[in-house]
Interface confidence: low
């Protein structure tokens, strides 16, 4: 039987009446144009909604926007357009919301052609009040907040100037001209690339990388011949042009660009690219594009310094620079990532890793599903997940995979069951153990969201027709109830719930269409009365993550430790609550070869945990370039995986000697770096 239709599904008592009392409609006094929604702060209940409507006139486009504010999670909205002097707000800049709970908001206004600069509206009290500020420049990008101090803002101008404000946008100063890309680093540091000759495009590969640690009082050139740069975790990466030809290589720094090392990664040509797929303070996943327009490349995982890389996955699907990849961090379980590979016959298959890229496997076939016609063997096939690439290809996939750190183990995604991703209409699948096992949750495509840290899952069918029904589950997608939230169906445009999945409110957005007009409408449903009581100790059960063999003493060991979680029982209908904190008990594991990656000059043959010397390096001294010095490596081939906490057990020997010899990296060596002050 279909999920949610078997006899074991008990109904939630009197839910229709409970939800009806907690369903709030708001009709916006707007013609339907576009709508964008932002949450201001965490657990504040404050939502800003910006609606914009373009009237195309013969000579120009006339725009009108309205700003609405809710402070009760979307149940009621107040029109606050007068606070921004009824100004038309530029939607391409969105609403720049400050970090953490700063309560800061910046809106960028549309200004007439001849004006000296742009205009912003600033709020530092969760959008209760706004201050209008005229800018001495026209912004090219959205204002960027420093992660450490929300009063510090940076922006690029249409003339490629780098502008900084130290008082939340009240006063602005141009600290550098000819800037291509600027990013905040840690400790209020700004990294940016500059061009010397014509433009960013013309100087690509000849850019300079600069750093300022004092908001523009002084500068240091930390790199030359730069193509691009990126920040990930504690790593600063730069792709640098080679001296001799048009190839480029990745260099990495862990000290804000004072010293650099060449990453042991393949160089790439003009048409290829590097991409940081994921990074944390321990390591980085790097994609290196294949030569030619293949649409795939190789994933490499780094060591703890970002220098030595192990090949993680071949034929990784990634279409073009800035194109589509399905790489997804499953945030509900440590070490889990999902992505797609392009097989030899050009079909797309999903792969999953449970150990941060150490090994990749296919997803296990869901118990309650049959293999489709993509499968050669009807009894043996896998689940294949639809993500960004499927969405870009306009397949019938309304949403990417979903996981939340505080909904432990839960992953929801569209998928098909066979030997490859199918063009057929997908179904929705759920895993409650971080991707090890899967179950078909809903027939056909749906929008879905997680509420109350996994206590409730909400879904709406993806349909071209107007809808008025929402589905919800209180047992991690096993059983579903349906609730008709309005008599008059609406054209659905999106589900909105507060980021972090702690809320019990869901907003259904859409528009109503009549013969003469169409209007935005939202329905906010509060599920607090469905989960009547607070969860108690008896509602939780102990769950060992990554458990595959309970008989094995090392069961659940991933990256050197195992974790036991307290998880809500599926049968318990209660509130985790907004203050819910994931309870976990870690325990250290003994080291095995699985806890080590292969060192520079070594590789792991398939289906083998031992690292063996690369044939071309056999008998050679292993020397590599580190911080501009040549290092001699004495190793038996192993290096501990970044973030691995194992102790005891296997302990391979490793020693690095400084050869006290300079080695050439075509990058700027430390002594050549210059500084200057303003």
């Amino acid at each position: 039987s279909a999920p949610g239709e078997d006899e074991e599904c008990g109904r939630v008592r009197d839910f229709v009446a409970k939800l009806a009392n907690n369903t709030h409609q708001h009709v916006f006094d707007d013609l339907r144009g576009s709508v964008s929604l932002s949450w201001v702060g965490d657990s504040t209940g404050v939502i800003l909604v910006l609606t914009t409507f373009h009237v195309p006139l013969v000579i120009m486009t006339f725009g009108q926007s309205k700003l609405y504010r809710s402070e009760d999670y979307g149940k009621n909205f107040k029109d606050i357009t007068d606070l921004i002097n009824n100004t038309f707000i530029r939607t391409e800049f969105g609403m720049a919301i400050g970090p953490e709970n700063s309560g800061k908001v910046v809106l960028t206004a549309e200004v007439s052609g001849g004006s000296r600069g742009g205009r912003i509206f600033r709020s530092s009290d969760f959008a209760k009040n706004f201050v209008q500020t005229d800018l001495p420049f026209h912004p090219l990008t959205q204002m960027m907040y420093s992660p450490q101090n929300s009063d510090y803002l940076l922006a690029l101008s249409t003339e490629n100037g780098l502008w900084v404000s130290k008082n939340f946008g009240g006063k602005w100063e141009e600290i550098h001209k000819a800037v291509c890309l600027a990013k905040w680093g840690s400790d209020n540091t700004i990294f940016f690339t500059t061009y010397a000759n014509g433009s960013c495009k013309a100087d690509l590969g000849a850019l300079e990388l600069w750093r300022t640690s004092d908001l523009g009082k002084s500068f240091k050139t930390i790199g030359v011949k730069i193509y691009s740069f990126g920040l990930g975790g504690r790593f600063l990466f730069a792709s640098v042009m080679a001296d001799k030809d048009t190839t480029r290589r990745i260099h990495v720094s862990t000290d804000q660009g004072d010293t650099w090392s060449m990453a042991q990664l393949p160089s790439v040509g003009q048409e290829q690219f590097y991409s940081i797929l994921a990074a944390n303070d321990d390591m980085v996943f790097m994609h290196v594009d294949e030569p030619g327009d293949t649409g795939f490349g190789t994933i490499f995982t780094s060591d703890d310094r970002g220098i030595v890389y192990s090949k993680s996955l071949d034929r990784h699907l990634y279409t073009t620079t800035g194109g589509e990849t399905d790489f997804t961090n499953v945030t509900s379980l440590r070490g889990v990532y999902i992505t797609s590979v392009l097989s030899e016959d050009n079909s797309i298959q999903t792969m999953i890793t449970f150990d941060q890229g150490g090994r990749w496997t296919h997803l296990r076939k869901p118990e309650n599903s049959e293999c489709d016609a993509t499968a050669k063997n009807k009894n043996e096939c896998s689940l294949h997940i639809h993500a960004s690439y499927s969405i870009s290809q306009k397949l019938n996939v309304p949403m990417a995979p979903l996981s939340e750190p505080n909904a432990v183990g839960i992953v929801i995604a569209h998928g098909s069951v066979g030997d490859a991703i199918s063009v057929m209409v997908p179904d929705v699948y759920i895993s409650d153990d971080g991707g090890y096992s899967w179950t078909k949750m809903l027939e056909g495509p749906h929008y879905y969201t997680i509420l109350d840290s996994g206590g409730i899952i909400v879904a709406i069918e993806h349909s071209s027709r107007p809808i008025n029904v929402i589905k919800f589950s209180t047992d991690e997608g096993q059983c579903w109830q349906t609730y008709t939230f309005t008599r008059d169906p609406i054209y659905f445009t999106g589900l909105a719930s507060e980021p972090g999945a702690r809320s019990m409110n869901i907003s259904i957005w859409g528009f109503t269409e009549s013969f003469l007009t169409s209007q935005w409408v939202s329905y906010t449903i509060d599920f607090k009365d469905i989960l009547e009581r607070n969860c108690e100790e008896k509602d939780y059960t102990i769950w060992l993550a990554h458990s595959t063999d309970p008989e094995d003493y090392e069961d659940g060991c991933i990256l050197g430790y195992k974790e036991q979680f307290l998880r809500l029982r599926k049968s318990s209908v209660c509130q985790n609550g907004r203050d819910y904190v994931v309870t976990k008990q870690p325990s250290i594991c003994l080291c095995s070869l699985e806890d080590f990656l292969c060192d520079f000059g070594y590789y792991r043959p398939e289906n083998d945990s031992k690292c063996v010397e690369q044939p071309e390096l056999k008998g050679h001294d292993l020397e590599f370039c580190l911080y501009g010095r040549e290092e001699h490596l004495t190793t038996n081939g192993y290096r501990k995986i970044p973030g691995d906490k194992c102790q005891g057990g296997v302990n391979p020997v490793r020693e690095v000697k400084d050869l006290k010899k300079k080695c050439t990296s075509n990058f700027l060596s430390p002594e050549k770096q210059n500084s200057k002050s303003n």
């Epitope: 649409g295 073009t320 050009n346 797309i348 489709d372 016609a373 290809q393 199918s422 057929m424």
Partner: antibody, heavy 129, light 107 residues
């Protein structure tokens, strides 16, 4: 040999429904997809949708969404196409065609497409009051 | 949806001559393209798949070329049995779509 045999001609009134069958033989029925294509008098070919005979999942062209239903019976190796709320402009010859590579989403390079390699003889449906 | 445009609508050729039929896609279909031949009162017949591969039993005088958005079907030396309507069809993205057809008639 591989063949697809369709049901006979039908005459229907506007607003009625028609159900056309297509019986496959000479190959493993569930191993490959089946498309339905129609051709109005003097007009070109128009793709209506596709069914996976193994799992029964379907994908329909937007134009026919809500009016067309494709089903299959694996015990008789037959696929069916039902079109409801018939109008005069639905008068056409309806073909089933084996579509071996409706199977996987295309990669960014080319997925190999094998074409609709076997066609039924066609079923004429006339809608007239 | 991807729109397929065939040209010319009608092509008049003498037997023994070469015929070149064009098919253009509104966006790239890579090589996910097939050509079909249809004679009056008959079902279409697959000629070319994968843009350039001849289907089983199709004579060597039929050849397909192109990739992306521009495709060509060439009949090197027309035989009397080749006078028919020819359709191209893409299968890059659903819904599959056909061109309007090119009628090859005797000059």
């Amino acid at each position: 040999q591989v063949q697809l045999v369709q049901s006979g001609a039908e005459v229907k009134k506007p607003g009625a429904s028609v159900k056309v069958s297509c019986k496959a033989s000479g190959y493993t029925f569930t191993s490959t997809y089946m498309s339905w294509v129609r051709q109005a008098p003097g007009q070109g070919l128009e793709w209506m949708g596709i069914i996976n005979p193994y799992g029964g999942s379907t994908s329909y062209a937007q134009k026919f969404q809500g009016r067309v239903t494709m089903t299959r019976d694996t015990s008789t190796s037959t696929v069916y196409m039902e079109l409801s709320s018939l109008r005069s402009e639905d008068t056409a010859v309806y073909y089933c065609a084996r579509d071996p590579s409706g199977i996987a989403a295309a990669g960014p390079a080319s997925r190999y497409y094998y074409g609709m390699d076997v066609w039924g003889q066609g079923t004429t449906v006339t809608v007239s009051s | 949806e991807i729109v397929m445009t065939q040209s010319p609508a009608t092509l008049s050729v003498s037997p023994g001559e070469r015929a070149t039929l064009s098919c253009r896609a509104s966006q790239s279909v890579s090589s996910n393209l097939a050509w079909y031949q249809q004679k009056p009162g008959q079902a279409p017949r697959l000629l070319i798949y994968g843009a350039s591969t001849r289907a089983t039993g199709i004579p060597a005088r039929f050849s397909g070329s192109g990739s992306g958005t521009e495709f060509t079907l060439t009949i090197s030396s027309l035989q009397s049995e080749d006078f028919a309507v020819y359709y191209c069809q893409q299968a890059r993205l659903g819904p599959w779509t056909f061109g309007g057809g090119t009628k090859v008639e005797i000059k």
